[in-house]
Interface confidence: medium
């Protein structure tokens, strides 16, 4: 029960985190700048990974995409790449984790397979979260070190226009969304990895073989299994011979230490 809860919670937390990473990547407010501020009018410039916008106190707003790749700072390209990798890994992780969820039955998928898938998705969420945190942190560092260029200087592909005023940018809302989302994805990934340990069947030094004896004086073990021996090489713990048909609910799986919480 605790394993299922941990896995489910990890999935939900990661889902929220990845949604946040997508939102942050699409947002325009990665950096904000007060271009001009007086009692009559105020002009704000805010920039994202894909376009730059201007908003005036009068209500006028305009956004423009970055038309050129060559004129953009290499660091901005790196941030874009990190965020996209984070989204892609996160999306794949979500897809894998859906099939790995203990509460969802797909054919005759065994716990070991689900454990492996849970671990895989967990690792993907962790890397996804780290990519997002790294991307946002690189961008924040650009702002702190004043590396971020002023609006017009970025658009060298548009005719080499030169900005007349160089002003400092401040952190935009997208940075905080990205940090929180990356953290949530990371936490979700860790939770999935923890859940994986509970899903994995207990490894022992011997492999048990269950069988049905052919007599009437057979002592039944609790849960429907008959007497077992501690030898043989049947690694899957499958019954070699089943004398009578039995429903799936009657079959008891081997308990692990994680089942008792």
């Amino acid at each position: 029960m605790a394993v299922t809860a941990c896995q489910g919670l990890g999935f939900v937390v990661s889902l929220i985190g990845i949604a946040g990473i997508i939102a942050a990547t699409c947002m325009d407010q990665w950096s904000t700048q007060d271009l001009y501020n007086n009692p009559v009018t105020a002009v704000f410039n805010y920039q994202g990974l894909w376009r730059s916008c201007v908003r005036e106190s009068s209500g006028f707003t305009e956004c423009r995409g970055y038309f050129t790749l060559l004129g953009l700072p290499a660091m901005l390209q790196a941030v874009r790449a990190l965020m996209i990798v984070g989204i892609v890994l996160g999306a794949i992780g979500l897809l894998v984790s859906i099939f790995a969820l203990k509460c969802i039955r797909i054919g005759s998928m065994e716990d070991s397979a689900k454990a492996n898938m849970t671990l895989t998705s967990g690792i993907m969420f962790i890397v996804s979260g780290l990519c997002a945190i790294a991307g946002v942190s690189v961008f924040a560092n650009m702002l702190v070190t004043n590396f971020w260029m002023s609006t017009a200087n970025m658009y060298t592909g548009m005719g080499g226009m030169v900005q007349t005023v160089q002003t400092r940018y401040t952190f935009g809302a997208a940075l905080f969304v990205g940090w929180v989302a990356g953290g949530l994805t990371l936490i979700g990934g860790v939770m999935m990895c923890i859940a994986c340990r509970g899903l994995a069947p207990e490894e022992t030094n011997y492999k048990a073989v269950s069988y049905h004896a052919s007599g009437h004086s057979v002592a039944y073990k609790p849960g429907g299994f008959k007497a077992s021996t501690g030898f043989g090489s049947n690694t899957k713990n499958k019954k070699i011979y089943d004398g009578g048909a039995r429903t799936e609910d009657e079959v008891q799986s081997y308990p692990s230490k994680h089942d008792y919480v």
Epitope: L35, Y36, V54, E62, R64, T151, M158, G159, T164
Partner: nanobody
């Protein structure tokens, strides 16, 4: 490199109309937002109107709203400012400017024309 040349200025009576033009040289004109600024004698630079690169959105100063209309023809690389119901306080040198955004902020504009004088007097 974009170069801007204004024309159409002159003397006009109060209540009259005038149409200013701004011809741009350079193939990248359509990439830029363009605007009009004015400077009255002894005063600072004042925003008049601006239009986005596509012409899809315009931005006007409160003092000219309803009287002035800005437009552009990207095929002809030309910007226009139709001025109606002119007043004495509209007397100024009018400058055409090219920038990335159609904002009232003069610092946004990297290219400037030499200006054309508009005098409103009876």
């Amino acid at each position: 490199e974009v170069q801007l040349v204004e024309s159409g200025g002159g003397l006009v009576q109060p209540g009259g109309s005038l149409r200013l033009s701004c011809a741009a040289s350079g193939r990248t004109f359509s990439n830029y937002a363009v605007g009009w600024f004015r400077q009255a004698p002894g005063k600072g630079l004042e925003f008049v109107a601006a239009i986005t690169w596509s012409g899809g959105s315009t931005n006007y100063a409160d003092s000219v709203k309803g009287r002035f209309t800005i437009s552009r023809d990207n095929a002809k690389n030309t910007l226009y400012l139709q001025m109606n119901s002119l007043r004495a306080e509209d007397t100024a040198v009018y400058y055409c400017a090219g920038g990335f955004f159609a904002t009232s902020y003069s610092g946004n504009y990297g290219y400037w024309g030499q200006g054309t004088l508009v005098t409103v007097s009876s």
